[in-house]
Amino acid sequence: SDGGAQDCCLKYSQRKIPAKVVRSYRKQEPSLGCSIPAILFLPRKRSQAELCADPKELWVQQLMQHLDKTPSPQKPAQGCRKDRGASKTGKKGKGSKGCKRTERSQTPKGP
């Protein structure tokens, strides 16, 4: 559904996504209309589903930090729109609320 608004993630995935297959992430924030805070990881393969994860988990924080310091291979779409082929894993329609794209900083290498 090209141009469709992103739905809310309702529950966290039990599986973890390997760091090297993730392209970027975006934050879902309850203050913007979704029921739970979440991090949605976008796989490099656009045909694969986003993965909804708990921002309090150690592995999620590690992956977010890694992505924050890595220059994005391509500029993410502006706004917060569903990628072609995104999954319907426990999400409900909420318009474009609750959806915040996190751009990755273009920092030079080094911690």
């Epitope: 390997p18 090297k20 309090k56 592995w59 924080q61 590690q62 890694h66 911690p111």
Partner: antibody, heavy 117, light 107 residues
Framework: EVQLLESGGGLVQPGGSLRLSCAAS????????MSWVRQAPGKGLEWVSA????????SYADSVKGRFTISRDNSKNTLYLQMNSLRAEDTAVYYC??????????WGQGTLVTVSS | SYELTQPLSVSVALGQTARITCGGD??????ASWYQQKPGQAPVLVIY???ERPSGIPERFSGSNSGNTATLTISRAQAGDEADYYC??????????FGGGTKLTVL
């Protein structure tokens, strides 16, 4: 200056307990995961435990699971390691290390724990 | 449990290139890091995310990681490079594993 300073090491008998502390300064403590890493005399590095930014999520090496507990007090910029049921093989220098993504970018100088009767 | 295997020791002639390997089941699918430790000192990060250098680490240090082997390469080896080197990697648990360490001798 970014700094980590461990304390609390010492001599303890087998079966005893000890609590290590790591005081952090020079950076925003609650923006980083933290880990404990140990090194037995003359041996290599062994990761012990890690904790997420706010302390919600914790992870342990199999060798210490059920005996050691990692925690943090972000208001005091301090990381802790509570060590119970200590064994001779727990004798080591214990380092605290700051985690960023998938690596440790800042290390303390270590504190020596000796388990002996 | 996951294991990383390093050679116990590697020797290199002054000014030549040293390569230290770190073997692990599909380590190329994870991010590897490398730490230098000199006697009586804490470890220091020299390579992270397979091949990135922290600020302050000479360009002579580089890394690669694919398949079952991560490699630390030190070109134009200097006497000051003599140290123990450890590879490290996180698995998905997440738990961290270090290799057994490699003693680098510069001849």
């Amino acid at each position: 200056e970014v700094q980590l300073l461990e304390s609390g090491g010492g001599l303890v008998q087998p079966g005893g307990s000890l609590r290590l502390s790591c005081a952090a300064s020079g950076f925003t403590f609650n923006s980083y995961s933290m880990s404990w890493v140990r090194q037995a005399p003359g041996k290599g590095l062994e990761w012990v435990s890690a904790i997420s930014m706010e302390g919600y999520s914790k992870s342990y090496a199999d060798s210490v699971k059920g005996r050691f507990t990692i925690s943090r007090d972000n208001s005091k910029n301090t990381l802790y390691l509570q060590m119970n049921s200590l064994r001779a093989e727990d004798t080591a220098v214990y380092y605290c290390a700051r985690g960023y993504g998938y690596y440790f970018d800042v290390w303390g100088q270590g504190t020596l724990v000796t388990v002996s009767s | 449990s996951y294991e990383l295997t390093q050679p116990l020791s590697v020797s290199v002639a002054l000014g030549q290139t040293a390569r230290i390997t770190c073997g692990g089941d599909s380590i190329g699918s994870q991010y590897a890091s490398w730490y230098q430790q000199k006697p009586g000192q804490a470890p220091v990060l020299v390579i992270y995310d397979d091949n990135e250098r922290p600020s302050g680490i000479p360009e002579r240090f580089s890394g690669s990681n694919s398949g079952n082997t991560a490699t630390l390469t030190i070109s134009r080896a200097q006497a000051g490079d003599e140290a123990d080197y450890y590879c490290g990697s996180w698995d998905s648990n997440p738990t961290h594993v270090f290799g057994g360490g490699t003693k680098l001798t510069v001849l």
